[in-house]
């Protein structure tokens, strides 16, 4: 038996941030579980590690360089991700795999969420103006 | 005027537990990420753990991650730190930290420290 | 992790003088760069977060500059409350790292 996962097909990150909603067909409340997020359409990059342990406060971190926070609803984990750069621009899929109580559980392979960030249109400063157009 | 004033330092012997408080006064603490950070004698500031403003979430350095607890009472303006299995490298100068609303790992106050020493 | 690598270990100067401090990240670090003075005894203080936006109350002899992997604290005038450890620190990757430290001492 395996876990449904559903996410936004497609987030646009406004000043380098972004909050990614992970739904499960699965209540969360009361089991010792592990939400990560990946990058990539090989999910090769871990991008975000958040464990729960029975409701108790979430234990959230990144191998990878990551900023990111977690937040756990009764069937979803909300990832927060903080100073993401354009090149980061990429596919990112929702995992859960629950420890306990047995059995074992994990998720099938969502459809994934494309994660477009937007770079920061910085204004001309007064002192500086650019060309001007003609 | 923002305060944090940290207490609960002391000598404790190699894998031992100490609890840090940290008191916060002057700001809305609640609203507030809140982190610990040390500073062993005569060297570098080094980030520990942090914990959001509702005290649902935490992060912890690897050096420390399954010793140390980090935690909040926001009723009690008050923010811990659990340190067990204590060893010698632990020995530091411990503050806590605010980070300003606008980021997570920024530190716009700081308290004045308390010293961990960690000897047999 | 990013390293940040602070150059000089110590800087010898005279009250009046300009004091400039470099930082270097082994990787991009944006403009995610934030400065702390520290004296002996006391806390760290926050003086420039994001590169080159001065924290509350510090005054504007203190100004930062730089993006990328390159950063740099300036200290036009230096003042006798001045001489103290510097740090730059970074917050653009996770865990948030923090330099090794610049001395600036009295010459």
């Known amino acids: 038996n395996k876990i449904l996962v559903k996410q936004s097909p497609m987030l646009v990150a406004y000043d380098n941030a972004v909050n990614l909603s992970c739904k499960y067909s699965y209540n969360l409340f009361s089991r010792e579980f592990r939400a990560s997020l990946h990058k990539g359409l090989d999910s090769a990059v871990e991008v975000c590690v958040v464990y729960g342990n029975y409701s108790q406060q979430l234990q959230v971190y990144s191998k990878t360089g990551f900023n990111c926070d977690g937040k756990l609803g009764n069937e979803s984990v909300t990832f927060y991700l903080q100073n993401l750069y354009v090149n980061q621009t990429d596919i990112y899929f929702c995992k859960i795999e629950v420890m306990y109580p047995p059995p074992y559980l994990d998720n099938e392979k969502s459809n994934g969420t494309i994660i477009h960030v937007k770079g920061k249109h910085l204004c001309p400063s007064p002192l500086f103006p650019g060309p001007s157009k003609p | 005027e923002v305060q944090l004033v940290e207490s609960g330092g002391g000598l404790v012997q190699p894998g031992g537990s100490l609890r840090l408080s940290c008191a916060a006064s002057?700001?809305?603490?609640?609203?507030?990420?809140m982190h610990w950070v040390r500073q062993a004698p005569g060297k570098g500031l080094v980030w520990v753990s942090r914990?959001?403003?509702?005290?649902?979430?935490?992060s912890h350095a690897d050096s420390v991650r399954g010793r140390f607890t980090i935690s909040r009472d926001n009723a009690k303006n008050t923010l811990y730190l659990q340190m067990n299995s204590l060893r010698a490298e632990d020995t530091a100068v411990y503050y806590c930290?605010?980070?300003?609303?606008?980021?997570?790992?920024?530190?716009?106050?700081w308290g004045q420290g308390t010293l961990i020493t960690v000897s047999s | 992790e990013i390293v940040l690598t602070q150059s000089p270990a110590t800087l010898s100067l005279s009250p009046g003088e300009r004091a400039t401090l470099s930082c270097r990240a082994s990787?991009?670090?944006?403009?995610?760069l934030a400065w702390y003075q520290q004296k002996p005894g006391q806390a760290p203080r926050l003086l420039i977060y994001?590169?080159?936006n001065r924290a509350t109350g510090i005054p504007a002899r203190f100004s930062g500059s730089g993006s990328g992997t390159d950063f740099t604290l300036t200290i036009s005038s230096l003042e006798p409350e001045d001489f103290a450890l510097y740090y730059c620190?970074?917050?653009?990757?996770?865990?948030?790292?923090f330099g090794q430290g610049t001395k600036v001492e009295i010459k």
């Open positions: 994001d590169a080159s």
């Open positions: 930290a605010r980070a300003p609303s606008s980021s997570w790992y920024d530190f716009d106050y």
């Open positions: 914990i959001n403003s509702d005290g649902s979430s935490a």
């Open positions: 620190q970074q917050r653009s990757n996770w865990p948030p790292t």
């Open positions: 002057g700001f809305t603490f609640s609203s507030y990420w």
């Open positions: 990787q991009s670090v944006s403009r995610y």
